[in-house]
Interface confidence: medium
């Protein structure tokens, strides 16, 4: 996932305490464009702007997520925010994918990684197995020390989790191959939620 | 609805280059992977790989590594195949598909093009 | 490579039969498994997924089963329709990979 994801979650952690929580609200009763659900009440309030960019990314996709922030933004009236998202939306050539409603409603969009944050952070406890997988392929050695240096597995998926906003599908994917090989029965029961 | 269209049937020489096109609507581009398979005559299927239009990303199959490269057109909706170096190994239908979801990596392949064959022939 | 290996390669039986392909996976791939079916001439459709699932519009007929390195697929009460080559593929890991197939043909 690429520039769009990155802009907003720059945009989001621009926010004071105060004005993302004034965001969420506005999320919460925001007109959405026809095939697109509405993030849960419960959910969202308590979500950092991590959590919230990877929300708004799996729920929107990049193009229409970008372009939602933007009117929240413009709406809460940080105009020179919304104008930072505008010129990444032309730059990116965003608008153009952003025209169409979700080809297939009842089609899940957004990465598994993406989508299932949180549990994979409560959940996954062979968190060392993980990271041996993404060693080298995805994670610099750097990351990967940083990563172990955390104490627990919860410590340690939150500090990985805050490297894949940079990450690419094939590295998200990387991490996907790996859960499933030592936690298949999480992402199945992940899967089916 | 989704549609995926690939270009025509090619005749090629022994060592020479191919690029097949794949042509897709009715989806956003940029959310979706495309996958490559190819099935050689009375044969089974094979995974080449996948492109992301969205980032760009790619992954092979070891065995199609520096034979096959994925490339893929955001302004014209089109992802492409290039098949270098082709020997009658290479003979074969080339599809491009396009999996049910953007959802993960266990993909199934929902949705495919109709097919290009291509015959290496001096 | 995770290898997958199907049985029979071919099969002959009469209409309205039951009968059932198998896909035994090299090693565990616990419920990413796919079947394709594949009529002459034409693309693979899809069937099922993640070993079980029928997809849209496929007929009730048609099912799958199992888990870790073995799966099933029946299709009872045999249509003249469904003369074609089944094949399964795994999404456990790359690269993924498809059976040889099942061409099934009417007695």
């Known amino acids: 996932m690429g520039r769009a994801r990155d802009a907003i979650l720059d945009a989001l952690e621009n926010l004071s305490g105060d004005e993302l929580k004034k965001f969420k609200m506005k999320l919460l009763t925001v007109q959405l464009r026809e095939g697109y659900g509405r993030i849960p009440r419960g959910a969202l309030l308590q979500m950092d702007a991590i959590d919230l960019t990877d929300k708004l990314v799996s729920y929107y996709l990049e193009s229409y997520g970008l372009e939602l922030t933007m009117t929240v933004l413009r709406d809460m009236g940080l105009q020179e925010l919304a104008e930072q998202l505008q010129t990444t939306k032309e730059e990116s050539g965003a608008v153009a994918a952003a025209a169409s409603v979700p080809a297939q409603s009842t089609a899940r969009t957004g990465h598994f990684v993406d989508q299932h944050r949180q549990a994979l952070i409560a959940r996954v406890t062979e968190v060392d197995g993980v990271l041996d997988a993404l060693h080298g392929s995805v994670l610099t050695e750097g990351q990967y020390q940083a990563v172990r240096a955390e104490t627990t597995s919860q410590d340690k998926m939150r500090k990985l989790f805050s490297f894949v906003p940079s990450w690419n599908l094939t590295c998200k994917d990387s991490l996907l191959q790996a859960l499933k090989e030592i936690h298949p029965y999480l992402v199945m029961d992940l899967e089916q939620s | 609805q989704v549609q995926l269209q690939q270009s025509d049937a090619e005749l090629v020489k022994p060592g020479a280059s191919v690029k097949i096109s794949c042509k897709v609507s009715?989806?956003?581009?940029?959310?979706?992977?495309i996958h490559w398979m190819r099935q050689r005559p009375e044969q089974g299927l094979e995974w080449i790989g996948y492109?992301?239009?969205?980032?760009?990303?790619?992954y092979y199959n070891e065995k199609f590594k520096g034979k096959a490269t994925l490339t893929a057109d955001q302004s014209s909706n089109t992802a492409y195949i290039q098949v270098n170096s082709l020997t009658s190994e290479d003979s074969a239908v080339y599809f491009c598909a396009r999996p049910l979801y953007s959802y993960a990596s266990y993909y199934w392949f929902a949705y495919w093009g109709q097919g290009t064959l291509v015959t290496v022939s001096a | 490579d995770i290898q997958m290996n199907q049985s029979p390669s071919s099969l002959s039986a009469s209409l309205g039969d039951t009968i059932t392909i198998t896909c035994h996976a090299s090693q565990n791939i616990n419920v990413w498994l796919t079947w394709y079916q594949q009529k002459p001439g034409n693309i693979p459709k899809l069937l099922i997924y993640k070993a079980s699932n029928l997809h849209t519009d496929v007929p009730s007929r048609f099912s799958g089963s199992g888990s870790g390195t073995g799966f099933t697929l029946t299709i009872s009460s045999l249509q003249p329709e469904d003369i074609a080559t089944y094949y399964c593929q795994q999404g456990q890991s790359y690269p993924l990979t498809f059976g040889g197939g099942t061409k099934l043909e009417i007695k």
């Open positions: 492109i992301y239009p969205g980032d760009a990303s790619s």
């Open positions: 009715g989806y956003t581009f940029t959310d979706h992977t």
